[in-house]
Interface confidence: low
């Protein structure tokens, strides 16, 4: 969490941002909140990016003002106009690209004063893994697949029964470049699995950590997966 204040004491307002990560090709949110004002027409929101000449986005007098917008963000940004009056200056960024990563500044002017806060935005690709029993294999084998990751993640297997065991000798992980030549498909195979056990396939890079669990018993197979973004801290 980053909390910023205006420069001159009495005329400063609190602006709060949260560091976040964007998934390439999908829409992202750059979070920013501020002390609300009574009149929408008195609120100015400017989003800036370090190293970028033009503005990322500007909202003033109740509407978008995009004449100074940088080419890089043309047609890809929007604020939540109906929530500005309650202090939400968050920015929706469409079709996130690798090059969107960097330091952003959320700059706010209201009738109460000015304030700004920085936000670190990471970009990459992350997706939920799915673990399945590979019936085509000669021995009992699990196959963990996740369609989109970048940068290249690490993959670690774990099991409930053999806690702390190192499965690197009995697993094989491959990374296959996707058609857009940036993200990669992750496939990891675990051999010699035993029945009545829960196995976890953990995929992690510096942006996200995802886990796919599979519980294999004689009568059923249960799956569960979850994903968590790393380093989401507020300013």
């Amino acid at each position: 969490l980053i909390i910023g204040f205006g420069i001159s004491g009495r005329h400063s307002i609190t602006v709060t941002t949260v560091a976040s990560a964007g998934n390439i090709g999908e829409d992202g949110i750059l979070s920013c909140t501020f002390e609300p004002d009574i009149k929408l027409s008195d609120i100015v929101i400017q989003w800036l990016k370090e190293g970028v000449l033009g503005l990322v986005h500007e909202f003033k007098e109740g509407k978008d003002e995009l004449s100074e917008q940088d080419e890089m963000f043309r047609g890809r940004t929007a604020v939540f106009a109906d929530q500005v009056i309650v202090g939400n200056a968050s920015l929706r960024l469409k079709n996130v690209q690798l090059t969107d990563a960097g330091t952003y500044k959320c700059y706010i002017i209201t009738s109460k004063g000015k304030g700004n806060a920085n936000l670190e935005y990471k970009t990459g690709a992350f997706s939920m893994p799915e673990v399945n029993v590979d019936y085509n294999a000669s021995s009992e084998t699990l196959r963990c697949e996740a369609p989109r990751w970048f940068p290249q993640p690490t993959v670690v297997w774990a099991s409930q029964v053999d806690q702390g065991a190192n499965f690197s000798e009995v697993s094989n992980t491959s990374f296959e470049l996707n058609s857009e030549n940036v993200t990669m498909k992750v496939v990891s195979v675990l051999y010699n699995v035993t029945i009545n056990n829960t196995y976890s396939c953990m995929i992690e890079n510096d942006i996200a950590k995802a886990t796919g669990d599979i519980k294999v018993t004689e009568s059923e197979i249960k799956r569960r997966s979850h994903l968590q973004l790393l380093n989401s801290k507020a300013s």
């Epitope: 970028v52 940088d70 080419e71 890089m72 043309r74 929007a78 079709n95 690209q97 090059t99």
Partner: antibody
């Protein structure tokens, strides 16, 4: 097959408004931005602006701000451009054309609507 | 705005001959994502424009290999080898790197 259908002609009086339509078929309407291009008789092409049908996000050539208003109706896969306060300078052929954001080329164009402003 | 200047305005050419159209931009048209969105379109009389070349040198599907695009920075060229009757019309260059996006003034390809 992918098509953008536009009415052939519109005759309007000076000072009036006209709403041009562009009906898309043969593809997923919300997956492509819709652009509008102006061509005055015997002259070149001018880009007016674009709209993202998925959320109605618009981007205009500053020259046409206040003159053109772009909208879409997702239910009928139709894009519209309203031209206001018409003068003889607005007499032209208006084309709609689709452009996928990250391929960035106009691969399909409508046949164009001829707008004639005359009293 | 980026001004796109095409030369020549009119290009008389013999069938089977070669044609070359130049397009010069008033500033470098490299988009901030690194791509150069320079396209070529052909408009035949009474028709809407048709895409020939995108991103400087990529031929659109179905476009004969007689058409080729080249160039970088501010200078771009469309070449047509072995001109056929169906190639006649007005050729426009277009830049989609800097808004407002702009077209060249057009080059009319006609029979000599």
């Amino acid at each position: 097959q992918v098509q953008l259908q536009q009415p052939g002609a519109e005759l309007v009086k000076p000072g009036a408004s006209v709403k041009l339509s562009c009906k898309a078929s043969g593809y997923t309407f919300i997956s492509y931005w819709m652009h509008w291009v102006k061509q005055r008789p015997g002259q070149g092409l001018e880009w007016i602006g674009e709209i993202d049908p998925s959320d109605s996000y618009t981007y205009y050539n500053q020259k046409f701000k206040g003159k053109a208003t772009l909208t879409v109706d997702k239910s009928s896969s139709t894009a519209y451009m309203q031209l206001s306060s018409l003068t003889s300078e607005d007499s032209a052929v208006y084309y709609c054309a689709r452009r996928k954001t990250w391929d960035w080329y106009f691969d399909v164009w409508g046949a164009g609507t001829t707008v004639t402003v005359s009293s | 705005d980026v001004l796109m200047t095409q030369t020549p305005l009119s290009l008389p050419v013999s069938l089977g001959g070669q044609a070359s159209i130049s397009c010069r931009s008033s500033q470098i048209i490299v988009h901030s994502n690194g791509n150069t969105y320079l396209e070529w379109y052909l408009q035949k009389p009474g028709q809407s424009p048709k895409l020939l070349i995108y991103k400087v040198s990529n031929r659109f599907s179905g476009v004969p290999d007689r058409f080729s695009g080249s160039g970088s920075g501010t200078d771009f060229t469309l070449k047509i080898s072995r001109v056929e009757a169906e190639d006649l019309g007005v050729y426009y260059c277009f830049q989609g790197s800097h808004v407002p996006w702009t077209f060249g003034g057009g080059t009319k390809l006609e029979i000599k």
